[in-house]
């Protein structure tokens, strides 16, 4: 009658940090000899527990192995780490000099469930402009088992990644994932988000999300217009420079008269649009009595360290006009006005 070593579970899954029991029962108390637990097989197998006086941190016997009739040689491994993954064998030896291995259980594979780290989404170092294609990368690490799902979304719409890789490709204690997606920016993207969603067996149907706010990666340049308002009195003319639908807020506005700086605006009260962009209006009051010759007024807008956008507006001096008090306004570079 031969002793049988029964390991009833082919595999067990345990969350990192938790405890797991590896079951092993024998069908016989004979022959006399020790029972030992190993991880792996062959020469490289590692002794995990021996039912003797030796001390094994984190591993304890489930039942009283000193009891004569005991057939239960199950062990409990506490505070499991990803390094504990592997196949464990309960092995019966016959007492001798040396002890000889006579029977092994079928093995129990321990899968250590480790949660993926919160996904981190990174984008380009420099801001992109509408219609530009930009890449975003999502990374998560430290998960086990290897099987994982990663999805990309932009404003609720799923995006298809350029590439997703899980490393290493072979067997390992834990794994990392990296995925890249390409997004075409548009001027309405200031309020948009790109989301990387990671689903894994350890997450109980509550995927982890990494978010990239496109406001950090987009630049929408302003539309600049200069207009002249009807004179408020015979001695002054109102010029308005309007920068519309720009992002981010960083804006400098300079008024020039015939190429010379007349006023430097650092906008404080920007108007925010529903799409997340900003508008800014600058009023420039021109004293008509100081200008008898033609004057070119320039509104120069510097946005987010980009080259300046300039819009010119010419106001004709008093000497050019026979029809006193009449006013002609021309768009952008050709606006004219007669002083009285």
């Amino acid at each position: 009658t031969e002793v049988k070593v029964i390991q009833p579970e082919k595999s067990v899954s345990v969350a990192a940090g938790d405890s797991t029991v590896l079951n092993c029962t024998l069908t016989s108390l004979l022959p006399v000899g020790p029972i030992r637990w190993y991880r792996g097989v062959g020469q490289s197998r590692q002794l995990i527990y021996s039912f003797t006086t030796e001390h094994f941190p984190r591993v304890t016997n489930v039942s009283d192995a000193t009891k004569r009739s005991n057939l239960d040689f199950s062990i409990r491994i506490s505070n499991v780490t990803p390094e504990d993954a592997g196949t464990y064998y309960c092995v019966k030896f016959q007492r001798g000099s040396p002890d000889t291995e006579i029977q092994s259980g079928g093995g129990t594979e321990v899968y250590v469930l480790a949660k993926p780290s919160p996904p981190e989404v990174s984008g380009p170092a420099d801001r992109g402009i509408p219609d530009q294609k930009v890449n975003f990368t999502c990374k998560s690490h430290g998960f086990s088992p290897r099987n994982i799902t990663l999805k990309w979304f932009k404003d609720g719409q799923e995006l298809h990644p350029l590439e997703t890789t899980v490393n290493p490709s072979g067997k390992n204690v834990s794994y990392n994932i990296s995925s890249t997606v390409r997004v075409v920016l548009n001027s309405m993207d200031v309020n948009s988000k790109v989301i990387c969603e990671v689903a894994h067996i350890t997450l109980d149907r509550s995927p982890l999300r990494g978010i990239a706010n496109l406001s950090n990666f987009i630049r929408v340049s302003p539309t600049v217009k200069v207009t002249q308002q009807s004179p408020t009195s015979m001695n002054q003319v109102n010029l308005t420079c309007r920068a519309e639908r720009f992002y981010p807020e960083d804006l400098q506005l300079i008024w020039l008269e015939n190429g010379n700086v007349s006023r430097n605006d650092t906008p404080k009260n920007l108007t925010k649009n529903t799409d997340g962009t900003y508008n800014y209006t600058s009023l420039f009051l021109v004293n008509s009595s100081a200008h008898r010759e033609d004057v070119v007024f320039t509104c120069q807008v510097k946005h987010d360290q980009q080259p300046a956008i300039t819009r010119n507006h010419t106001v004709l001096g008093f000497a050019h006009s026979s029809d006193q008090g009449s006013m002609q306004t021309f768009p952008d570079n050709n606006a004219t006005h007669n002083w009285n």
Epitope: T1, S28, L29, S63, K67, R68, S69, L71, D72, S74
Partner: antibody, heavy 119, light 107 residues
């Protein structure tokens, strides 16, 4: 002093499932070190070990009955039970529950309950 | 399964006689053997555990010996209250098995 008491129907119809419960008093079923067994004795015959549940969890069955037998424990009620399916007249017997002692022998037994399989 | 063969299947002896029952295992079971007494209509009672150890409260006229495959149970001086059937049981191998029993009667 631990005492055991079997309970269950005395008459079971062929092909049905025989269900017996052993109630433990004077001690806890989950206290360490013991096997809790079911044994039966056919009329005028010897003793046959059906199976046992060990305090640490494993359940052992006699291979001759394994396909039909289930032993379970309810620690909250301090009971363990036996279910034997698809019974025939050959399962007519006195059924005992027992507890293994500090040493290896079965030192506490219930008084036994007679189960007859008949239509 | 380990077969446990008990002999004789029955015996008749006088009060005060020495009674010997043997139990043979089909394979080496070391000393993993118990002896029980069962009186008519009652549950078995443990007398000897681990082949030779007397259970607490059991009279010293009962004894056991043996190891490996051959075991002996002895009543040194038969008493009227010893009328019963005696069983050996091995627990070295699953399933645990009992001998067929020896019925002891008074002449």
């Amino acid at each position: 002093q631990v005492q055991l008491q079997e309970s269950g129907p005395g008459l079971v119809k062929p092909s049905q499932t025989l269900s017996l419960t052993c109630t433990v008093s004077g001690g806890s079923i989950s206290s360490g070190g013991y096997y809790w067994s079911w044994i039966r004795q056919h009329p005028g015959k010897g003793l046959e070990w059906i199976g046992a549940i060990y305090y640490s969890g494993p359940i052992y069955y006699n291979p001759s009955l394994k396909s039909r037998v289930t032993i379970s424990v309810d620690t909250s009620k301090n009971q363990f039970s036996l279910k034997l399916s698809s019974v025939t007249a050959a399962d007519t017997a006195v059924y005992y529950c027992s507890k293994e002692g500090y040493h290896s022998g079965m030192d506490v037994w219930g008084q036994g309950t007679t189960v007859t399989v008949s239509s | 399964d380990i077969q446990m063969t008990q002999s004789p299947s029955s015996l008749s002896a006088s009060v005060g006689d020495r009674v010997t029952i043997t139990c043979q295992a089909s394979d080496d079971i070391s000393d993993y053997l118990n002896w029980y007494q069962q009186k008519p209509g009652k549950a078995p009672k443990l007398l000897i555990y681990d082949a030779s150890n007397l259970e607490t409260g059991v009279p010293s006229r009962f004894s056991g010996s043996g190891s490996g495959t051959d075991f002996t149970f002895t009543i040194s001086s038969l008493q009227p209250e010893d009328i019963a059937t005696y069983y050996c049981q091995q627990f070295a191998y699953l399933p645990w098995t009992f001998g067929g029993g020896t019925k002891v009667e008074i002449k």
